[in-house]
């Protein structure tokens, strides 16, 4: 028998520095978690203690904090190289800055293989990107070899900016021939490493012949055997065992997100490469694990540029950006309109000739807007200004909801109107009319939404049974501000980009902004 230790991370999302328990900015260092310096300490400890160790990442290192905004992926390559990762799979967010934003900072700089078997380059890109990412890689581990085959969510063209010269194939269809190839190369221990979410991970384990272990990402799934060490609630045991169609027991793992845990899986193989046993658990990277001093010093060196960036001008406003609670929690406010417009703009993806865009709607809880921006300061808008508007470090996510769920959400928006509560919705691509003289739960008298399957966008009445795509804060997707119906009824949820980054990118792109209050939210006569 031969034992392999798989250490794995996924969905780190730019958390290079330690964070608070909820993965936001670290406030009280004695209670902070994660970060690459602490991760390195634990990885080195395990490498010293155990003979056959692989350190793998299942994608979405990109996007999530100012680190990515400023360094654009160079920080990922640098610190992953420093930690001596053995392989990484491409996630959807690796394409957020286009293919160039993946090739230059990461693919060309990484000293470890970056993998995806279901992404195929075509046209002029094919030769440019050739060899920079691979479908699979055979890694020597001790006296043995292990094959790692990569995969990426086929939804990436809807979630990021991979351009038109990359084709995202079905994961299972693309993986099988690559696994077969590895088998012909006499590689009998094969790990599928990828970024398509837990449901697809389980399907791969079930359907792809020859895959021994699946290490996944994208769905931020927390698995744990026994008593969990922090506030994450396990979606199942670690490892999650799937019985494959050919009768094998295939362990599937994921390690939540944000570098809070290091996945730790021990696999025992027999001489024919069959999995005899698998066990382990994610390791909580809390303050009992010291931060490695040399990596920490490097982090501090790289940090300097971030502090300078915060005060640089991103663009200008020639109007007052009203982010006051008096406005945004009671009526349409132009700060809400600006943020929603930025959210839609960030999700422009022309992937189908029938659609001008795949999503046209945005909702945003007014309570999430926490500051105005005064145009009389020379009109200057900085990252620092935006951090005051959006201080909670969330993401703007893509969900799919039925029209009936959206109607419930808008009823909830005004169910206790007038108390300065945060659930009052700011919108984009939506026209809503409320009648506050009616009883709570029956106050939405008109709800029109911007069409997507059209060449000239126009507003049509919401259809209760239709499925709509909506951009919204992760806070709402998780049921925050009482929006339980969104959490309970959403049909799909893909995590998006850092909120401040979305707005800052939009302002930089527009250069000068002048959002108006333009009748997106109205109150019918006699009720307001």
């Amino acid at each position: 028998a031969w034992e392999l230790t798989i250490l794995h991370t996924n969905d780190v999302h730019s958390r290079l520095e330690q964070t608070s328990e909820d993965s936001s900015k670290c406030v009280n260092a004695s209670r902070c978690m994660g970060g690459v310096a602490r991760l390195f300490t634990k990885v080195q400890q395990i490498r010293r203690a155990e003979p056959n160790v692989l350190l793998l990442d299942a994608g979405d290192q990109y996007q999530g904090t100012i680190w990515f905004t400023v360094y654009k992926g160079a920080e990922v390559a640098h610190f992953m190289n420093a930690l001596r990762y053995d392989a990484m799979a491409l996630g959807n967010h690796e394409f957020d800055n286009g293919v160039e934003g993946l090739i230059e900072p990461l693919l060309k700089e990484a000293k470890f293989p970056i993998l995806s078997a279901n992404i195929k380059a075509k046209g002029p890109l094919a030769s440019q990107i050739s060899g920079l990412y691979l479908p699979y890689k055979v890694l020597p581990v001790g006296d043995e070899v292990v094959g790692i085959v990569g995969y990426t969510s086929k939804e990436t063209p809807f979630l990021s900016n991979p351009g038109t010269n990359l084709v995202f194939e079905d994961e299972i269809t693309a993986l099988q021939p690559e696994v077969d190839k590895l088998k012909t190369l006499n590689v009998n221990k094969i790990i599928a490493l990828g970024h398509s979410g837990f449901e697809m991970d389980k399907l791969i384990a079930q359907k792809v012949r020859g895959v021994d272990v699946v290490v996944g990402g994208h769905s931020n799934t927390f698995l744990y055997t026994g008593n969990p060490p922090s506030k994450e609630v396990p979606a199942g045991k670690y490892p999650f065992i799937v019985t494959s169609d050919d009768g094998r027991k295939v362990p599937v793992v994921q390690a939540y997100a944000f570098g809070k845990y290091l996945g730790y899986l021990k696999i025992e193989f027999d001489e024919r490469g069959n999995v005899i046993s698998s066990h382990g658990n994610p390791i909580l990277l809390n303050s009992s694990i010291p931060e490695d001093p040399s990596i920490k010093a490097d982090i501090n060196k790289w940090r300097i540029k971030l502090d300078n960036y915060s005060t640089q001008e991103l663009g200008k406003t020639i109007v007052y950006l009203d982010g006051s609670s008096q406005s945004c929690r009671f009526r349409e406010c132009n700060m809400g309109n600006l943020i929603c417009d930025a959210m839609i703009n960030n999700n422009l993806r022309h992937t189908d000739e029938m659609f001008w865009n795949h999503v046209s709607m945005c909702i945003l809880n007014g309570g999430g807007i926490r500051s105005p921006i005064d145009e009389r300061n020379n009109g200057t808008i900085t990252w620092e200004n935006l951090a005051a508007v959006l201080p909670f470090g969330g993401t703007f996510d893509l969900v799919q909801l039925k029209g009936s769920t959206l109607k419930k959400a808008f009823e909830h928006s005004v169910h206790r109107y007038g108390q300065s509560t945060g659930e009052f919705l700011q919108v984009g691509g939506i026209h809503v009319v409320y009648d506050l003289s009616r009883k709570p739960g029956d106050r939405v008298v008109k709800l029109d939404v911007l069409c997507t399957k059209c060449r000239v966008p126009s507003y049509d009445p919401l259809k209760m049974d239709e499925v709509y795509k909506v951009i919204l804060p992760n806070f709402l997707a998780n049921g925050g501000d009482g929006f339980q119906m969104i959490k309970d009824e959403l049909l799909r949820h893909d995590s998006g980009d850092q909120d401040i980054n979305v707005v800052s990118t939009y302002i930089s792109k527009m250069k000068v902004i002048y959002p108006a209050v333009e009748g997106r939210i109205k109150f019918s006569t006699g009720s307001h």
């Epitope: 909820d22 406030v27 609670s325 008096q326 926490r370 500051s371 005051a388 169910h415 108390q419 009482g482």
Partner: antibody, heavy 116, light 105 residues
Amino acid sequence: VQLVESGGGLVQPGGSLRLSCAASGFTFSSYDMHWVRQAPGKGLEWVAVMSYDGSNKYYADSVKGRFTISRDNSKNTLYLQMNSLRAEDTAVYYCATEIAAKGDYWGQGTLVTVSS
Amino acid sequence: IQMTQSPSSLSASVGDRVTITCRASQGISNYLAWYQQKPGKAPKLLIYAASTLQSGVPSRFSGSGSGTDFTLTISSLQPEDFATYYCQQSYSTPHFGQGTRLEIK
């Protein structure tokens, strides 16, 4: 995150007192702020709230018209001006951020005693 | 909106499973929080939005309910859990329950 209340003490019925709450370790101007009180040996009673930018204020019926909540975001400080004090206002007064939400932090309290 | 907690006091032993209930005088959706308070200390938030565990709070604490009836459960009492517990609604201007004193049997 730290919230430090001050300004409590002994005051006669009908008198006035101004409580302060100095905040540090977080972006004070981003948070709604509350005052909550607790009479000796009794339960918690919510007193007042002010939105992050000062544009919305709400009060418990028991203090309406007598107490005024205010804030100075440039000084990271929350205030409670208490007028026409009564014996039943005797309590430990706590300031707190966004109660009943993720960003919920409380100070250690300051004691106000209304007695002749 | 009035909040009624029961029981007002409760004796239990380390390792016990304990349940405290809270009833609102009208529907409050999931706008309910649970606090723990020890003598001479400020209250500490345990649960918000009826069932969401606050960061740093042990997983033995859990909350459930929606509308008018809510429950705080401590799955296995630890010595440090003996304290007074309050529910609080934030559907309208905040209002606390009268408290439940949990003491050692």
